[in-house]
Amino acid sequence: APVRSLNCTLRDSQQKSLVMSGPYELKALHLQGQDMEQQVVFSMSFVQGEESNDKIPVALGLKEKNLYLSCVLKDDKPTLQLESVDPKNYPKKKMEKRFVFNKIEINNKLEFESAQFPNWYISTSQAENMPVFLGGTKGGQDITDFTMQFVSS
């Protein structure tokens, strides 16, 4: 069966939107009005992995682009990147672990934990116009809570 996907945008708990920053990076900043069109639309695919009531494994692709968020070691540090894939083969139910995030819902907020690197989360900073990254702390000054807005196909 084909993998189930939905289109959505994400905003951090400070209401910053996610936009492209160069070809292989996302950044977070406050957008309003027509600028909202800049925000990236994700194709969130529900993939194979360890699942529970509040934890669902997903892959985060960029809609109509052959780019997926992935987690890899760079200079011995877990790092978030946008990785180019062959669109003929993706998305798929059994995604490589670096593409998988545990979508965790807590109090109507979402966290995205790397399946490859447990306790590392998709993060933004308090500052405006700075990259989205993989952070190793929750509840500190970095932001790990997001809300999801559904986008019609």
Epitope: S21, G22, E25, K27, L29, K77, S123, S125, Q126, A127, E128, N129, M130, P131, F133, L134, G135, G136, T137, G140, Q141, D142
Partner: antibody, heavy 118, light 107 residues
Framework: EVQLLESGGGLVQPGGSLRLSCAAS????????MFWVRQAPGKGLEWVSV????????RYADSVKGRFTISRDNSKNTLYLQMNSLRAEDTAVYYC???????????WGQGTLVTVSS | DIQMTQSPSSVSASVGDRLTIICRAS??????LAWYQQTPGNAPKLLIH???SLQSGVPSRFSGSGSGTDFTLTINSLQPEDFATYYC?????????FGGGTKVEIK
């Protein structure tokens, strides 16, 4: 008053290492992104590296990637730049700078000179 | 990487002149542009951020304009202390990049 004071520069042979420090005062260091920017003698400005307040996010210019490492100790209000495998073209004044709104450098240190020569 | 091109690279002017420096980005950077002033032997000083916002403490004779790829720094009525080198810098994406600088000399 915001103050940034670099130290650790000097003369080093090609292939050698140096660690630069930047002592920050007059603001809540742990809340700010920080940059290293360099300027070769008689040349323009070149951005080198950035680090987030928590230290989890770092980025580097292609010219230093794999050789330089940015880090910080928020308990000591200090920013660092570990420079390995130094080359003659790394000769420059190295500035640390506090990152202001959206990615500008709103306060700069006075700079420390790194000379790579045999 | 985004290339930043400044013009002119140098200019001679007199006290009281109105001066315009142009900065062009190789791609759209929205309004994520800063301008700096550097005098010999000193660190750069932030003048303008977000293309048009005057940094606190900077005299109002300095102004910035533009968005997208084309930006200008204008100095109305040059003062003796304004003879320096000016740099633009894009903050749209990493790696951050600077223009090559514009040296403003006394005519």
């Amino acid at each position: 008053e915001v103050q940034l004071l670099e130290s650790g520069g000097g003369l080093v042979q090609p292939g050698g290492s140096l660690r630069l420090s930047c002592a920050a005062s007059g603001f809540t260091f742990s809340k700010y992104f920080m940059f290293w920017v360099r300027q070769a003698p008689g040349k323009g400005l070149e951005w080198v590296s950035v680090i987030s307040p928590s230290g989890w996010m770092t980025r580097y210019a292609d010219s230093v990637k794999g050789r330089f490492t940015i880090s910080r100790d928020n308990s000591k209000n200090t920013l660092y730049l570990q420079m390995n495998s130094l080359r003659a073209e790394d000769t420059a004044v190295y500035y640390c700078a506090r990152v202001g709104y959206g990615g500008n450098s709103d306060y700069w240190g006075q700079g420390t000179l790194v000379t790579v020569s045999s | 990487d985004i290339q930043m091109t400044q013009s002119p690279s140098s200019v001679s002017a007199s006290v009281g002149d109105r001066l315009t420096i142009i900065c062009r980005a190789s791609q759209d950077i929205n309004r994520w542009l800063a301008w700096y002033q550097q005098t010999p032997g000193n660190a750069p000083k932030l003048l303008i951020h977000s293309a048009t916002s005057l940094q606190s403490g900077v005299p109002s004779r300095f102004s910035g304009s533009g968005s997208g790829t084309d930006f200008t720094l204008t100095i109305n009525s040059l003062q003796p202390e304004d003879f320096a080198t000016y740099y633009c810098q894009q903050a749209d994406s990493f790696p951050l990049t600077f223009g090559g600088g514009t040296k403003v000399e006394i005519k």
